[in-house]
């Protein structure tokens, strides 16, 4: 999906009002310096591309974040403020339902959410280019 035509200011508002708080809640009890950020993003479409992938792709040691509150709110924000996003996600959602697993917060998931916080902060930077 090409995130170029999203309403970035509306997504930023959603991040500031709720998503950021849910990320903090997920990371509660973890020091902010515990994980090194190894990925970043260039402009807002890039940030959303990486946020979407990191939030919804299973990775080694962290099977799924998709059912976490911040992930569901991220998905809702993208669906509302990115034209055509919902249509591109129908097949992906169906596949995810088939492989849904018990929620387990592993250290790897905490590290992944720490990376997500960094990507969202970068997205939120006032000087970041739209595209």
């Amino acid at each position: 999906y090409d995130f170029t035509n999203c309403d970035f200011e509306k997504i930023k508002a959603a991040y500031l009002s709720t998503i950021s708080k849910d990320l903090i809640t997920y990371m509660s009890g973890t020091k902010s310096t515990e994980f090194n950020n190894t990925v970043s993003c260039s402009n807002r479409p890039h940030c959303l591309t990486e946020i979407q992938s990191l939030t919804f792709n299973p990775t080694a040691g962290c099977a799924s974040l998709a059912k976490e509150m911040f992930a569901m709110k991220t998905k809702a924000a993208l669906a509302i403020w990115c034209p055509g996003y919902s249509e591109t996600q129908i097949n992906a959602t169906q596949a995810m339902k088939k492989r849904r697993k018990r929620k387990v917060t592993t250290n790897k998931c905490l590290e992944q959410v720490s990376q997500l916080q960094g990507l969202w902060r970068r997205f939120n930077r006032p000087l970041l280019k739209q595209q």
């Epitope: 792709n57 990775t59 970041l128």
Partner: antibody
Framework: QVQLQESGPGLVKPSETLSLTCAVS?????????WSWIRQPPGKGLEWIGY???????SYNPSLKSRVTISRDTSKNQFSLKLSSVTAADTAVYYC??????????WGQGTLVTVSS | EIVMTQSPATLSLSPGERATLSCRAS??????LAWYQQKPGQAPRLLIY???SRATGIPARFSGSGSGTDFTLTISSLEPEDFAVYYC??????????FGQGTKVEIK
């Protein structure tokens, strides 16, 4: 300390597919960062080809996107480049590199690929 | 596409002298700029990122400055091992990251 090493054929015929592999040691490619390919034609500047991230996203240079595939083999801790329909203009030293998806902090030594019949 | 232009193409200096290399972007890249050093037969090495932050292990004689469209890499006092080609790279314009054509710093 992370080390990267490119390998693959040094000579490819025009219209064929160039295939290179980058073996990574000292860091797991599924643990963090992005993993990228960059090339440098003889005597010229650098050109970014593309990357994949440790969580599976990929991004390619628009000028090469239709011909490029970057894939990974986490069991061998290596990643690969395929560039199809090559011409003489694809003759270059090809580097693999570790990236934070913005800039490139560790590089392989590079491998020269010549496109010629 | 953002075009990166480096000047001069070649800089002839003696060890101990100060080197000032320029990189200009065709449109603003904010501070999204990196500098690399490349010696003959070797891979590039990251020197500076975010326009002015030194990469790990890079000596203090290397410094970067600038933002927007005009950037400078300064080597305060050239050491023999500093004679090489230097490239700038913008990462403001994903997915079209681009490099300059390089400045060669040679021994006078």
């Amino acid at each position: 300390q992370v080390q990267l090493q490119e390998s693959g054929p040094g000579l490819v015929k025009p219209s064929e597919t160039l295939s290179l592999t980058c073996a990574v040691s000292g860091y797991s490619i599924s643990s963090g960062y992005g993993w990228s390919w960059i090339r440098q034609p003889p005597g010229k500047g650098l050109e970014w080809i593309g990357y994949f991230s440790y969580y599976g996203s990929t991004s390619y240079n628009p000028s090469l996107k239709s011909r490029v595939t970057i894939s990974r083999d986490t069991s061998k801790n290596q990643f690969s480049l395929k560039l199809s329909s090559v011409t003489a203009a694809d003759t270059a030293v090809y580097y693999c590199a570790r990236t934070n998806l913005l800039y490139f902090d560790s590089w392989g030594q590079g491998t020269l690929v010549t496109v010629s019949s | 596409e953002i075009v990166m232009t480096q000047s001069p193409a070649t800089l002839s200096l003696s060890p101990g002298e100060r080197a000032t290399l320029s990189c200009r972007a065709s449109q603003s890249v904010s501070s999204n700029l990196a500098w690399y050093q490349q010696k003959p037969g070797q891979a590039p090495r990251l020197l500076i990122y975010d326009a002015s932050s030194r990469a790990t292990g890079i000596p203090a004689r290397f410094s970067g400055s600038g933002s927007g469209t005009d950037f400078t890499l300064t080597i305060s006092s050239l050491e023999p091992e500093d004679f090489a080609v230097y490239y700038c790279q913008q990462y403001s314009n994903w997915p079209q990251y681009s490099f300059g054509q390089g400045t060669k710093v040679e021994i006078k």
